[in-house]
Interface confidence: low
C-alpha cells in the first residue's frame, strides 16, 4: 500500500500556503484528486510529489494515491482543507445527473472543518427542501440526497453558518431521470373475449411509463384503429388509455386485437382474441376416460372441463345409481377457473365403497341450456371364494363359487393332508378351469362364476382347494372331507344359490 507524507488523514491550510504531498510506493504511483489549478506534479520512480505554492479554496478536496501495479489495488488518501473565511464552499460540479432511486451526491466541499456543525441544504432562493427529502452530509464529499426522486430535480445550494449568518454556495442543478427500464408497460383487457352477435363489448388498451414520451395504439387484424386517447398521470407514471366500445358486435369485429406501445427503449405489444358467436354455448369434456375402473377402497378424482359463454348459472355433480340414493358431498366437489370462459370441476371420491360404484354425472347450465357428462365407475374386487360338496346327476361334485371384479379365474388343487391352503410340496393334482360358468354379471357389480369338480370318491386324508384370482388379488377355500365315502350319501334336497 502506498504511503502519503505528511502522514495525517486531513490537512488544514490557509489560502496562499505552500502544500507538498509526497506519495511513496513499491512501484510507480499515481495521484488522483479534484480538478484544481496551481498544482505541479513531479515523479521519481516509486515516489510522486504533488505541490502548490499558492493554495486556494479550490484545492480543497481528497487526494488519493494509487499503485497501478499492486494486485490488491491498495490506495492511500489525504483530505486537504484550504480554509478560506470568505468562501466556505468548494463546489466541484454545478450539474449532477442521476437516475431515480440512486443516491445523488451534491459535491459542495466545506473548506473549514469547524463549520460542519452549521451546514444545511436548501433550494435556491432560500426555499426549503421538499418534504420527504432524505439527505446526509460529509465534509469531505458534500450533501447526499438518498434515493432521489424525479420530483427532486431542482436547483440546490449548500449553506454554512459563518459569523451568525448563512453563507450559500453557488447553485447545483440536480437532474433526476426516470429509469426507463424498457418499453412502456401494457395492459389489454380482457385477455380473451367472447360475445354473442348483437351484444356490447369493450376492449381497453392502456400503456404507462415513467416518461411521457411514448406512443400507444390499438390494432385489429393488423389495421390501426382510430380511437381517441385519454391521458393521465398517477403513481408517478404517465398513462395513455384507448377504449374501444362496440354497441352491437358482429362477426366482422371478431379477430385478433393488439395493443402496441413504443418509446426510445423499444416496442411492446400484447394481443387478445375476440370471438363472436351466433348463440350461447356450453361444452363439457374430460381428459379422463368416461369409463373408470378403480379398486375398492382406493380414491378417484373425476375431472370435467367446461367451456361456456355466457357464464354458468348452475352446476353440480349427481350420482345416478344404480346403488344407494346418496349424492356426492358438496365438500368433495371443487371448482377452479382457468380463465373467463374455461373452468375445471373436480369430484373427489376418496376410499371408494361398494355402494359408490355407478354413474356420476356432472351437470352444468347456462343460457344455452343444460349439458351433462357422465362417468361410469366400476369397482374392482379381489375374489371371494366358497366351496360346497353336493351331488349333481348322482355324481359327487365340489362346487366353487368365486365372486370379484374383473372376472376371476379358477384353479382346483388336490393336496395331501388337512390344510387351510395347499402348498407346493403337498399338491397331488392341479386342474385349471378355463371357462367357469358365469352366474351373474351385472354392470357395476362383482362377477360371480361357478366351477364344478366331479370327484368320484372324496379322499379322507386330503384337502381340495379352490383358488380364484384376478388383477386385484386372489382368494381361496379349502374343503376338507369330514369322513371317507361321504359321496355315498347324496343330500335329499339340493339347492345352491351363489
Amino acid at each position: 500500500i502506498p504511503v502519503i507524507e505528511p502522514s495525517v488523514p486531513e490537512l488544514v491550510v490557509k489560502p496562499g500556503a505552500t502544500v507538498t504531498l509526497r506519495c511513496v510506493g513499491n512501484g510507480s504511483v499515481e495521484w488522483d484528486g479534484p480538478p484544481s489549478p496551481h498544482w505541479t506534479l513531479y515523479s521519481d520512480g516509486s515516489s510522486s510529489i504533488l505541490s502548490t505554492n499558492n493554495a486556494t479554496f479550490q484545492n480543497t478536496g481528497t487526494y488519493r494515491c494509487t499503485e497501478p501495479g499492486d494486485p490488491l489495488g491498495g490506495s492511500a488518501a489525504i483530505h486537504l482543507y484550504v480554509k478560506d473565511p470568505a468562501r466556505p464552499w468548494n463546489v466541484l460540479a454545478q450539474e449532477v445527473v442521476v437516475f431515480e432511486d440512486q443516491d445523488a451526491l451534491l459535491p459542495c466541499l466545506l473548506t473549514d472543518p469547524v463549520l460542519e456543525a452549521g451546514v444545511s441544504l436548501v433550494r435556491v432562493r432560500g426555499r426549503p427542501l421538499m418534504r420527504h427529502t432524505n439527505y446526509s452530509f460529509s465534509p469531505w464529499h458534500g450533501f447526499t440526497i438518498h434515493r432521489a426522486k424525479f420530483i427532486q430535480s431542482q436547483d440546490y445550494q449548500c449553506s454554512a453558518l459563518m459569523g451568525g449568518r448563512k453563507v450559500m454556495s453557488i447553485s447545483i442543478r440536480l437532474k433526476v431521470q426516470k429509469v426507463i427500464p424498457g418499453p412502456p408497460a401494457l395492459t389489454l383487457v380482457p385477455a380473451e373475449l367472447v360475445r354473442i352477435r348483437g351484444e356490447a363489448a369493450q376492449i381497453v388498451c392502456s400503456a404507462s411509463s415513467v416518461d411521457v414520451n411514448f406512443d400507444v395504439f390499438l390494432q385489429h387484424n393488423n389495421t390501426k384503429l382510430a380511437i381517441p386517447q385519454q391521458s393521465d398521470f398517477h403513481n408517478n407514471r404517465y398513462q395513455k388509455v384507448l377504449t374501444l366500445n362496440l354497441d352491437q358486435v358482429d362477426f366482422q369485429h371478431a379477430g385478433n386485437y393488439s395493443c402496441v406501445a413504443s418509446n426510445v427503449q423499444g416496442k411492446h405489444s400484447t394481443s387478445m382474441f375476440f370471438r363472436v358467436v351466433e348463440s350461447a354455448y356450453l361444452n363439457l369434456s374430460s381428459e379422463q376416460n368416461l369409463i373408470q375402473e378403480v379398486t375398492v377402497g382406493e380414491g378417484l378424482n373425476l375431472k370435467v372441463m367446461v367451456e361456456a359463454y355466457p357464464g354458468l348459472q348452475g352446476f353440480n355433480w349427481t350420482y345416478l345409481g344404480p346403488f344407494s340414493d346418496h349424492q356426492p358431498e358438496p365438500k368433495l366437489a371443487n371448482a377452479t377457473t382457468k380463465d373467463t370462459y374455461r373452468h375445471t370441476f373436480t369430484l373427489s371420491l376418496p376410499r371408494l365403497k361398494p355402494s359408490e360404484a355407478g354413474r356420476y354425472s356432472f351437470l352444468a347450465r347456462n343460457p344455452g341450456g343444460w349439458r351433462a357428462l357422465t362417468f361410469e365407475l366400476t369397482l374392482r374386487y379381489p375374489p371371494e371364494v366358497s366351496v360346497i360338496w353336493t351331488f349333481i346327476n348322482g355324481s359327487g361334485t365340489l362346487l366353487c363359487a368365486a365372486s370379484g371384479y374383473p372376472q376371476p379365474n379358477v384353479t382346483w388343487l388336490q393336496c395331501s393332508g388337512h390344510t387351510d391352503r395347499c402348498d407346493e410340496a403337498q399338491v397331488l393334482q392341479v386342474w385349471d378351469d378355463p371357462y367357469p360358468e358365469v352366474l351373474s354379471q351385472e354392470p357395476f357389480h362383482k362377477v360371480t362364476v361357478q366351477s364344478l369338480l366331479t370327484v368320484e370318491t372324496l379322499e379322507h386324508n386330503q384337502t381340495y382347494e379352490c383358488r380364484a384370482h384376478n388383477s386385484v388379488g386372489s382368494g381361496s377355500w379349502a374343503f376338507i372331507p369330514i369322513s371317507a365315502g361321504a359321496h355315498t350319501h347324496p343330500p335329499d334336497e339340493f339347492l345352491f344359490t351363489p
Epitope: Q313, N316, L363, R365, G368, G369, R371
Partner: antibody, heavy 118, light 107 residues
C-alpha cells in the same frame, strides 16, 4: 318407483284456457338435475315439446307457443301445472308429462286426451 | 329451434330383419340425442340416450350411433313387439325437439 299422471278436462271450448296438472311420485323436483316436461301429440301426428320446468324453477317454452303457455310447480305437492290460453281445435292432442333428467324424458305419464270443440 | 328430420317416414319389414332408421339435425348437436318407441295408444318409451347408450331394460338388439348432425337407430333382428313408431329427440338446446317419427309395420 317413478310414476306420473296427467289430469285435466277432456273437453274445452275454443278461446278457453286449458289447465293440466301432472302429479308425480318416486322422485323429487327439488333434486338437482330433475325436470318435468309437457309434451303433446295431435292424433296421428308427431310429438311436440311444449314446456319444461327444472328444480331451480327455470322455465323453457316452445318458441311458437311461448305467449300462450305457463308452467309452474308445487314441490311440496309433487305437482307441475301447465296452462295454455286461447285454445283452438288445432290444439286437440294427447298431452303427456314426463320426468326429464339431463334432457332425457325417461318416465312418461299415460297421457290425457284434450279435445277442443264448441 | 333445431329441426329434426327422420327417414324413412315409414316402411314395412318382417321379423328377423335388420332395420335402420336415420335422424338428421339442422345443426350440430354433439351426442345429445335420444330415441323413443311408441305403440298405438301408449306413451313413448325411452330406448337410447346420448346417441348410443342403451336405457336399462331395453333389449340389446337396439343400438344407436352418430354424432354431430347424423344419427342412426338400428334394430339388429326385428321382433314382433318392435312394430311401432320411433322418434328421435335432440336435447342439445331449448326448446327440445322431436323428429316426425318413423313407423315400422309388418310386411
Amino acid at each position: 318407483q317413478v310414476t306420473l299422471r296427467e289430469s285435466g278436462p277432456a273437453l274445452v271450448k275454443p278461446t278457453q284456457t286449458l289447465t293440466l296438472t301432472c302429479t308425480f311420485s318416486g322422485f323429487s323436483l327439488s333434486t338437482s338435475g330433475m325436470c318435468v316436461s309437457w309434451i303433446r301429440q295431435p292424433p296421428g301426428k308427431a310429438l311436440e315439446c311444449l314446456a319444461l320446468i327444472d328444480w331451480d324453477d327455470d322455465k323453457y317454452y316452445s318458441t311458437s307457443l311461448k305467449t300462450r303457455l305457463t308452467i309452474s310447480k308445487d314441490t311440496s305437492k309433487n305437482q307441475v301445472v301447465l296452462t295454455m290460453t286461447n285454445m283452438d281445435p288445432v290444439d286437440t292432442a294427447t298431452y303427456y308429462c314426463a320426468r326429464t333428467q339431463l334432457g332425457i324424458a325417461d318416465y312418461w305419464g299415460q297421457g290425457t286426451l284434450v279435445t277442443v270443440s264448441s | 329451434a333445431i329441426r329434426m328430420t327422420q327417414s324413412p317416414s315409414s316402411f314395412s319389414a318382417s321379423t328377423g330383419d335388420r332395420v335402420t332408421i336415420t335422424c338428421r339435425a339442422s345443426q350440430g348437436i354433439s351426442s345429445y340425442l335420444a330415441w323413443y318407441q311408441q305403440k298405438p295408444g301408449k306413451a313413448p318409451k325411452l330406448l337410447i340416450y346420448a346417441a348410443s347408450t342403451l336405457q336399462s331394460g331395453v333389449p340389446s338388439r337396439f343400438s344407436g350411433s352418430g354424432s354431430g348432425t347424423d344419427f342412426t337407430l338400428t334394430i339388429s333382428c326385428l321382433q314382433s313387439e318392435d312394430f311401432a313408431t320411433y322418434y328421435c329427440q335432440q336435447y342439445y338446446s331449448y326448446p327440445f325437439t322431436f323428429g316426425p317419427g318413423t313407423k315400422v309395420d309388418i310386411k
